[in-house]
Interface confidence: medium
């Protein structure tokens, strides 16, 4: 990019309600997906060759909500290279100084599909294993850095065809700290876990218990803890699992407790019952072992005590899981996030407006040297986003949907007409 | 498009024999749990039994339990309930289903077993 | 086994009415309740599931909600082919149980 900006180098284009200025290497905008943030758009990069994913950030500093998050996302984005983690590839602004500083435009890696789309597809223990196994070694770099996600759920997760998987949005990641005592108000209702619903704060493995969810999602094929609010939602949970110890009561603040406590009392059904041998998805006897693996590992991640919940470092080692442990996948070095206050920033609406900016000048200025942080080689899908031709164990279809890479439970695609649909 | 077909049913006396068969078409038959739901005359419905995608795991309503045998054939894509020691309560229209999980999201038209002397 | 209530057992109504269903589980059930239409002399045919995901091709004029023990299924304007016997189903733990049916007749 050039030192001083000039308008040649942007166009725009309306996207459903909202302009798009972009970057002219950026074509054939197409709408995907819009969310708490903004709208997003697959596009082709006539550089790269690639398609690609552009979120625009519509005035990002409007509110604390909105800036806080921004900036946490661009930081993260810019530091965070895994491959179970999205990448972004470029960041820009149309506008050419700080004055007239309103949007930014995120560009990241296109995915095939959320898994709200696979969610109604029978995934064979192999596929089912693996897109488990690469959340989870997303989720272990994440907490690497000391960032504890807290709202992992499907539409937070994108898929490729060849069964590759990444997680997205890091709007609500919280550095870990050892202040227990956090708002119970940050994930997704269905996927949210007892210590958060209860008020207990939290640890890493808060985002075992989502897995959990997802996973359990993925073999029953509806959502599992459906609540209508807060409330329902621990109602939910004990009517499946059991009404927890006293043991587990103790831990909790003497009015959640004397709540909890009050609550009629569940048994709880056995995992054999919740997760039945036969809805499994099933193809060979050999399967039998494999969902009894699978239907372990189930009744270890979905704990409501998180003492006695299973770890992320556990869950990789878990015989369901294991066979595809990769050290440099699981145990890739942790991200430096550069900027230790991360967390605890709080500012007046102008000098996030700044901080996004500087950000933003950045990121033009590192990519203008040639010092943006190295891609996975895995970055981006191609323009047909059909799948290869191998019977690859982790082919998951063939593709026949839009791509995506909206990461709001409002934004996902309709999934009626999923990705796998032809591939179970 | 999604086909369920049973054939098999009639008029067996009680105490007597009878093999049901479910030939599926227009899906992968080896991924999908399936079900047999009965129906007697007038009656509502009543889950009967199911089967695993792979045919290794089977479930069986109590009231069919030790009698009644559900299998699979993958290459043939046909599901099979082999009934034995019929009951004049066995008597209804037996529908095979896709068991999406926990619910039957494609259903055949149902074959009907009598059994009575 | 979990017992599954419907109510009413049959009703009348008219072209163009807003109906509803009611189906009562003997213990909680979390949201793992499904609805069926069935038509005389036709297999069921699956409407809802997870008591409120309208399943694929089904028109939106039929809804679902509830949960735990109390679940509803409603027809927003009843239409001609509406005129079916309804069933619900709980699959919250086998065996899976139906309700006893509720027959919706034209008035």
């Known amino acids: 990019m050039s030192d001083s900006k000039c308008d040649s180098q942007f166009y725009s284009v309306q996207v459903a309600d909202s302009t798009f200025t972009v970057l002219k290497r950026y074509q054939q905008l197409k709408p995907i997906g819009s969310g708490a943030q903004g709208i997003v758009c697959a596009a082709f990069d006539t550089v790269l060759g690639i398609n690609v994913a552009v979120k625009k950030l519509s005035r990002p500093f409007q509110n604390q909500t909105h800036a806080k998050r921004a900036y946490r996302e661009l930081v993260l984005l810019k530091c965070v290279n895994h491959k179970n983690i999205i990448s972004l590839l470029n960041v820009f602004t149309p506008q050419k100084t700080l004055e007239e500083f309103q949007d930014v435009y995120l560009v990241m890696e296109l995915m095939d599909a959320n898994l709200c789309q696979v969610i109604h597809m029978e995934l064979d223990h192999e596929r089912m294993s693996y897109l488990l196994y690469q959340m989870l070694c997303g989720i272990k770099h994440l907490h690497s850095a000391g960032i504890i996600h807290r709202d992992l759920k499907p539409s937070n997760i994108v898929v490729k065809s060849d069964c590759t998987l990444k997680i997205l949005d890091f709007g609500l990641a919280r550095t870990a700290c050892t202040n227990f005592m956090m708002t119970p108000y940050v994930v997704t209702r269905y996927y949210r876990a007892p210590e958060v619903i209860l008020g207990m704060g939290y640890k890493e493995n808060v985002d075992i218990w989502s897995v959990g969810c997802i996973m359990g999602e993925l073999v029953k094929g509806c959502v599992i803890f459906q609540g209508t609010d807060h409330i329902d939602q621990w109602n939910k949970v004990i009517e499946q699992l059991g009404t927890p110890s006293a043991e587990f009561m103790k831990k909790l603040q003497p009015t959640v407790r004397n709540y909890v406590e009050n609550r009629p009392k569940y048994p709880g059904i056995k995992f054999e019952e919740l997760f039945p041998d036969w809805i499994f998805p099933s193809e060979s006897e050999r399967d039998k072992i494999k969902t009894s693996q699978a239907r372990d590992l189930l009744s270890k991640m979905l704990v409501i005590d998180p003492d006695k919940r299973i770890s992320v470092d556990e869950a990789l080692r878990h015989p369901y899981i294991t066979v595809w442990y990769d050290p440099a996948e699981a145990e890739a070095p942790p991200p430096q996030i550069y900027d230790a206050q991360l967390e605890e920033r709080e500012h007046a609406i102008e000098e996030w407006k700044e901080l996004i900016y500087k950000e933003v000048m950045d990121w033009e200025e590192r990519s203008k040297n040639g010092v943006v942080k190295d891609q996975p080689s895995d970055a981006a899908v191609s323009s047909n986003a059909t799948p290869s031709q191998s019977s690859s164990i982790n082919d998951i279809s063939s593709m026949s949907t839009e791509q995506t890479l909206a990461s709001d439970t409002d934004s996902s695609l309709d999934a009626s007409t999923g990705p796998l649909e032809g591939c179970r | 498009e999604v086909q369920l077909l049973e054939s098999g049913g009639g008029l067996v006396q009680p105490g007597g024999s009878l093999r049901l068969s479910c030939a599926a078409s227009g899906f992968t038959f080896s991924s999908y749990a399936m079900s047999w739901v009965r129906q007697a005359p007038g009656k509502g419905l009543e889950w009967v039994s199911a089967i695993s995608g792979s045919g290794g795991s089977t479930y069986y309503a109590d009231s069919v339990k030790g009698r009644f045998t559900i299998s699979r054939d993958n290459s043939k894509n046909t599901l099979y309930l082999q009934m034995n020691s019929l009951r004049a309560e066995d008597t209804a229209v037996y529908y095979c289903?896709?068991?999406?999980?926990?619910?039957?999201?494609?259903w055949g038209q149902g074959t009907l077993v009598t059994v009575s002397s | 086994d979990i017992q599954m209530t419907q109510s009413p057992s049959s009703l009348s109504a008219s072209v163009g009415d807003r109906v509803t269903i009611t189906c009562r589980a003997s213990?909680?059930?979390?949201?793992?309740l499904n609805w069926y239409q069935q038509k005389p002399g036709k297999a069921p045919k699956l409407l809802i599931y997870?008591?409120?995901s309208l399943q694929s091709g089904v028109p939106s004029r039929f809804s679902g909600s509830g949960s735990g023990t109390d679940f509803t299924l409603t027809i927003s304007s009843l239409q001609p082919e509406d005129f079916a016997t309804y069933y619900c189903?709980?699959?919250?733990?086998?065996?899976?149980?139906f309700g006893q049916g509720t027959k919706l007749e034209i008035k």
């Open positions: 189903q709980q699959s919250y733990s086998t065996p899976y149980t």
């Open positions: 289903a896709r068991s999406h999980t926990v619910y039957f999201d494609y």
């Open positions: 997870a008591a409120s």
């Open positions: 213990q909680s059930i979390s949201s793992y």
